[in-house]
């Protein structure tokens, strides 16, 4: 189960994101910062700092619009 305000690294980070985002999927950097996705992003924010549910959800992809 997800525990708020903790660091999440490794496989645990991937598994937690899959749980939080569900069918939406996710990306490891927010769309606005794709240029620097390898120098910032969720690994830095959640693994080396700390992260909560609200922050995790900002990395969930936007669901595709159904026609």
């Amino acid at each position: 189960a997800y525990r708020p305000s903790e660091t999440l690294c490794g496989g645990e980070l991937v598994d937690t994101l899959q749980f939080v985002c569900g069918d939406r999927g996710f990306y490891f950097s927010r769309p606005a910062s794709r240029v620097s996705r390898r120098s910032r992003g969720i690994v830095e924010e959640c693994c080396f700092r700390s992260c909560d549910l609200a922050l995790l959800e900002t990395y969930c992809a936007t669901p595709a619009k159904s026609e």
């Epitope: 660091t7 490794g10 645990e12 950097s29 120098s39 910032r40 690994v43 830095e44 693994c47 700092r49």
Partner: antibody, heavy 126, light 107 residues
């Protein structure tokens, strides 16, 4: 050639200090988390420390917290381990290792160590 | 911390034997497990990652399986080059931890 090469090991007295270096080549060093893993003589592997790709964030195993400092210089493709207040139980071969792996779109998806250096021996003894 | 326990500690086998090494985690690590081979005086070499994915260049006689807390490394037909020590490692969460190792020696 993709490789890691450690240096800086040697004999040091208890309480002393040593600085290890790991020179990386053949890959974009600045994009990868790097780690130190050690192995005491005749013993198994023990993860020591990791540092984020940009260098700003670090992790340590409990037994070295406050004594060891991991750092990196991405302009020199080099990883460091500053070891202070050394103890006999720190005697080991120290390996640097490359971790965090990206998929084709640049997303970090895995954290195993796919590249290791040959190691440098640190002996703490009076 | 997640404890990793390997069995057996030592395994005596002959060339051509099928060899199985077990690794158990103290809590679930999903499939976030790697296997390494180490020979005396050498650095570890990655064999398997994500429990069952074979690293590029590693012979197909090596295979990994398992998920959750129990994992196995299998060598389908032991070759002279395979006598070494094998370690499992979890990377589900920090601190990364290794099993104590399994030495595969000549019978």
């Amino acid at each position: 050639e993709v490789q890691l090469l450690e240096s800086g090991g040697g004999l040091v007295q208890p309480g002393g200090s040593l600085r290890l270096s790991c020179a990386a080549s053949g890959f974009t060093f600045s994009e990868y988390e790097m780690s130190w893993v050690r192995q005491a003589p005749g013993k198994g592997l023990e993860w020591v420390s990791s540092i984020y790709s940009s260098g700003g964030w670090t992790k340590y195993t409990d037994s070295v917290k406050g004594r060891f400092t991991i750092s990196r210089d991405n302009s020199k493709n080099t990883l460091y381990l500053q070891m202070n207040s050394l103890r006999a139980e720190d005697t080991a071969v120290y390996y640097c290792a490359k971790g965090v792996h990206y998929d084709s779109s640049g997303l970090p998806i895995d954290w195993y160590f796919d590249l290791w250096g040959r190691g440098t021996l640190v002996t703490v003894s009076s | 911390d997640i404890q990793m326990t390997q069995s057996p500690s030592t395994l005596s086998a002959s060339v051509g034997d099928r060899v199985t090494i077990t690794c158990r985690a103290s809590q679930s690590i999903s499939s976030w497990l790697a296997w390494y081979q180490q020979k005396p005086g050498k650095a570890p070499k990655l064999l398997i990652y994500k429990a069952s994915s074979l690293e590029s260049g590693v012979p197909s006689r090596f295979s990994g399986s398992g998920s959750g807390t129990e994992f196995t490394l299998t060598i389908s037909s032991l070759q002279p080059d395979d006598f070494a020590t094998y370690y499992c490692q979890q990377y589900n969460s920090y601190p990364w931890t290794f099993g104590q190792g399994t030495k595969v020696e000549i019978k």
